[in-house]
């Protein structure tokens, strides 16, 4: 699992590859802060609750974020 609480940032390794939006349990976007100088995106998968760190600079990940926000805006009244 590419996560660690012992370093300033949560993510050790990041992926450029998108996942299926429907397989996401949760998508956390952690802004840059005094503790970690970069934005971090942590995807929690429905299957096994596995967490994955996604590269916020990747165009494919940006496309994923757009798809997720579009899906959420459809659902909200």
């Amino acid at each position: 699992v590419p996560l660690s609480r012992t370093v300033r940032c949560t993510c050790i390794s990041i992926s450029n590859q998108p996942v299926n939006p429907r397989s996401l349990e949760k998508l956390e976007i952690i802004p840059a802060s005094q503790f970690c100088p970069r934005v971090e995106i942590i995807a929690t998968m429905k299957k096994k609750g596995e967490k994955r760190c996604l590269n916020p600079e990747s165009k494919a990940i940006k496309n994923l974020l757009k798809a997720v926000s579009k899906e959420r805006s459809k659902r909200s009244p």
């Epitope: 450029n16 299926n20 494919a60 496309n63």
Partner: antibody
Framework: QIQLVQSGPELKKPGETVKISCKAS????????MHWVKQAPGKGLKWMGW????????TYADDFKGRFAFSLETSASTAYLQINNLKNEDTATYFC????????????WGAGTTVTVSS | DIQMTQSPSSLSASLGGKVTITCKAD??????IAWYQHKPGRGPRLLLH???TLQPGIPSRFSGSGSGRDYSFSISNLEPADIATYYC?????????FGSGTKLEIK
């Protein structure tokens, strides 16, 4: 050099199953998603979906949900497309394409596998 | 899904001449368009991405421009090797879409 080598042509009957392969070489297989594209005879290119090569998770375009399955053999750097319960309209050339996910376009393609479905 | 309308479906031009192909998206695709050359029996070949960036090894006879919903692709100083079908691809969405293709013939 970077290449995607696809399996040879297939002749099948309606109702049968076909599984075609796409073997990657020249790069780290799990660093890039793999996509599949269909070209029916005399028609254009149609995107079918992709498989995340890190976790083996497939995502299908709406027109390819149900009878189509993407899978991997990571140790052999190979992606597979399986089509079940073949229909005449599945007659086409199928291409695998590596996606350069950081920028999100397809940069490397296989030469295609022709599947003919005929009774 | 984003729809891509490509035109013309075919065109014929003279050696040494210039051709232009257009693709129109049904929404803003933020310059995320790529162009491919496709010859029978081979996989498509990436020519340009992000509207106008040439892939390494692709001659500068190939060019692209556009923004918003409207994009164009040109080939100048046409050569026999340019005979092929050309496709645009939008990649500003998780769901990719190709244009319908333009078959180029040489007079």
């Amino acid at each position: 050099q970077i290449q995607l080598v696809q399996s040879g042509p297939e002749l099948k009957k309606p109702g049968e199953t076909v599984k075609i392969s796409c073997k990657a070489s020249g790069y780290t297989f799990t660093d890039y998603s793999m996509h599949w594209v269909k070209q029916a005879p005399g028609k254009g290119l149609k995107w079918m979906g992709w498989i995340n090569t890190e976790i083996g998770e497939p995502t299908y375009a709406d027109d390819f949900k149900g009878r189509f399955a993407f899978s991997l053999e990571t140790s052999a750097s190979t992606a597979y497309l399986q089509i079940n319960n073949l229909k005449n309209e599945d007659t086409a050339t199928y291409f695998c394409a590596r996606n350069y996910d950081y920028d999100a376009y397809f940069d490397v393609w296989g030469a295609g596998t022709t599947v003919t479905v005929s009774s | 899904d984003i729809q891509m309308t490509q035109s013309p479906s075919s065109l014929s031009a003279s050696l040494g001449g210039k051709v232009t192909i257009t693709c129109k998206a049904d929404q803003d695709i933020n310059k995320y368009i790529a162009w491919y050359q496709h010859k029978p029996g081979r996989g498509p070949r990436l020519l340009l991405h992000h509207t106008s960036t040439l892939q390494p090894g692709i001659p500068s006879r190939f060019s692209g421009s556009g923004s918003g919903r409207d994009y164009s692709f040109s080939i100048s100083n046409l050569e026999p090797a340019d005979i092929a079908t050309y496709y645009c691809l939008q990649y500003d969405s998780l769901l990719f879409t190709f244009g319908s293709g333009t078959k180029l013939e040489i007079k």
